[in-house]
Structures are given as C-alpha cells and as structure tokens.
Interface confidence: medium
Amino acid sequence: GVFNYETETTSVIPAARLFKAFILDGDNLFPKVAPQAISSVENIEGNGGPGTIKKISFPEGLPFKYVKDRVDEVDHTNFKYNYAVIEGGPIGDTLEKISNEIKIVATPDGGSILKISNKYHTKGDHEVKAEQVKASKEMGETLLRAVESYLLAHSDAYNEQKLISEEDLGGEQKLISEEDLHHHHHH
C-alpha cells in the first residue's frame, strides 16, 4: 500500500536562501553542521539532477547504517525537491521505498514554510510503523535546525555570488554562485 504523511515546519530563513543551503548544498552542509545525525554523503552516480543516487551514512549509535537516495526532481523556480529512499535504513521486507517531496514557500515575514510529504510504499498489506515516521520527522527537523543555525551565524553564506568562508566547516574559501549550486542537490 501507499501511506502518505505530511507535515510542515517553519524557518526564519528566506525561502531562496534556505533552498540553496538545505536542498542544493545539503550534501556538503549536513555532515559538517550535524555530524551527530549524518556522518557522510557520497555521490554514487549522476551530477545532482534527476536520477542521481547518493549514499547517506549515519554515525554509530543510530538505528540504521545508511540509506541510498534517488533524486527525482529539482525545481529551482518553485523551490521544490523530490527524492526517494530506495535502499538501506528501513527499506526491506516490508517497505519498498519512501517517496519524498519538500517544498519551500516564502512567508510574509521574510521567513519560509517547508511543506514535506512522505509517501511510504509498503509491500503487500504491511503498514508503516509510527516510530519510523516519527524518527524520520525528527531527523529532518535536526538537519533543518542545524542548517538554520549555521545560516544565522554566517550572514553572507548562500547569498548569491558571495564569498563564503568555509573554515568553520573544515574547508577552504570558495565562491558559491547560482551555477555552482545547481550541481549540489540534497534533501
């Protein structure tokens, strides 16, 4: 069956900036700003666009070792990102895949709302475990707040054509342009 769970959460970060950091450059940011949640993100195939496969590894102590995500759609105009969890983690005998949609919408106060849809594709008559949904939601919230904190502390980061000092992230300085960002996609 297919079980659809939706939620929304808010952020003080403007939609365009949050999309760049949280979605387009999450692969780089997550292990650095939230190492307790994600230890590494490895590009298995593709250049970040639809069809790209990524392996996300989790630190020891978490229930799962890794998941593999497939990028399905990246919409830079509507700040929308679709991807599916296709291997590892909860995927197995009872769960075929999890299709996810994240949409970031601007709010009148200059912040944004993240609208998140998770479709759990189960095998046969199996149902989705409530704790799995809860864990997934908590992971997303952890990553969002870590990225949000980083952006609040680094006002120049992920603004168009700004020089970002990545020393705090353990890297070197680099110019992040719109073009560069299109090569980095994640949830």
């Epitope: 929304e8 808010t10 509507n78 929308k80 601007a106």
Partner: antibody, heavy 119, light 107 residues
Amino acid sequence: EVQLVESGGGLVQPGGSLRLSCAASGFTVSSNSMSWVRQAPGEGLEWVSVIFSGGITYYSDSVKGRFTISRHNSKNTLYLQMNSLRTEDTAVYYCARHSNWNFDAFDIWGQGTMVTVSS
Amino acid sequence: DIQMTQSPSSLSASVGDRVTITCRASQSFDTYLNWYQQKPGKAPNLLIYATSSLQSGVPSRFSGSGSGTDFTLTISSLQPEDFGTYYCQQSYSIPYTFGQGTKLEIK
C-alpha cells in the same frame, strides 16, 4: 468522531472585544495546523489566521495587530481573541483543521459562530 | 498575495449535465489547490485536494484537474444534491486565498 465546535460569538459594539473558542474532539489540536476562516453575510470565504503545529502564527492583513490566534493543548481547544472590532468584522467565523495528509487542505470545519459588530 | 478568480460566478444546469467550474490563480503554483462545496447555512465541505485527489466520502462524479495557474472542477453528471456554492482555494502560500465562489443552481 472527529469534529470541531465553535462558541463565543455574539453582538459587540465597534471597538469591543470577543474571544472565540473551537473545541476539538477525535484528534489533537496541537498535532495539526489550524485556521480561522470567516464569511461575511452573503459573501465568500476569507482566511483570517493560522497557527502551525509548531506554534508559529500568521494573520491576514485585515486583522493583523487586532486578532490573536492561540491554542490550549490540554483543553484541545483553539482560540481567536478579537480586539478593536470593526463593523467589517461582522461574519460567521469557522475554525478549520489543516489535514496532515491532504496537502494542507481544510478537511474538517466547525459549524461556525456568528459575530455581529454593530452600534 | 495569490489572487484566485473563479468563473462563472453563477450557473444553472439540469440533472445529468456535465458541469465545469474554472479557477485561475494570479501566479503559478502546483499541487496546493483545493475545492470546497458549501450549502446555505452550512460550513464548507472539502471535495478535492491537491488539484485532483478526491476527498474520502466524496462521490466519484466530482473530479479536479489543472496545473500552473488554471484549475478546473468537473461534475460529470449533475445530481439534485449538488446545488450550492463552490470555492477554490490555494493552500500553497500565506495568506491562503479563496476564489469568490460559483453558485450552482439546479434547473
């Protein structure tokens, strides 16, 4: 049964205040985003305010600074505090639940409570 | 703000007719378009969510379609109980906005 029941409407003079309540049963108010929507006599629907499950609130420009949306988790009740009321606030006020499954559509509505602002 | 414009504002149709109501948005968005039916003196009732998904308990003669800025509600074979006012609504961005309504009367 999942339902919403509004109360607190009535006749009030311009400049006065009212507090509307919306008692929920069959689900937890704090787990869903909740909105207030109003309908002036003979008119269409107008969204008034929302409180997201995380507690963030937003208002339409027409009520901003005058109305306050809130919720009481243990009473499982949504509120709309309306101050500095104007004649144009006269309407039936509905509380509505945002579905967690149906892309933010308002899937459950109360029966409405009438607010009349008149001298 | 996203403005929602419905047409027609009213219409009269006979039982068995195919009825179409359109809704145009002032800016493009996807998925977050809903349709409600309201009968006199009653609260609105959700018919269609996410542009084309039928709300549980709603008869299959109701359907929704569209994308971008143009959306449509169709009643394939009008029934006597389908009278009332129909509203489109976008739940994509705040402030959430409704169309002005389409009043449907049965001939």
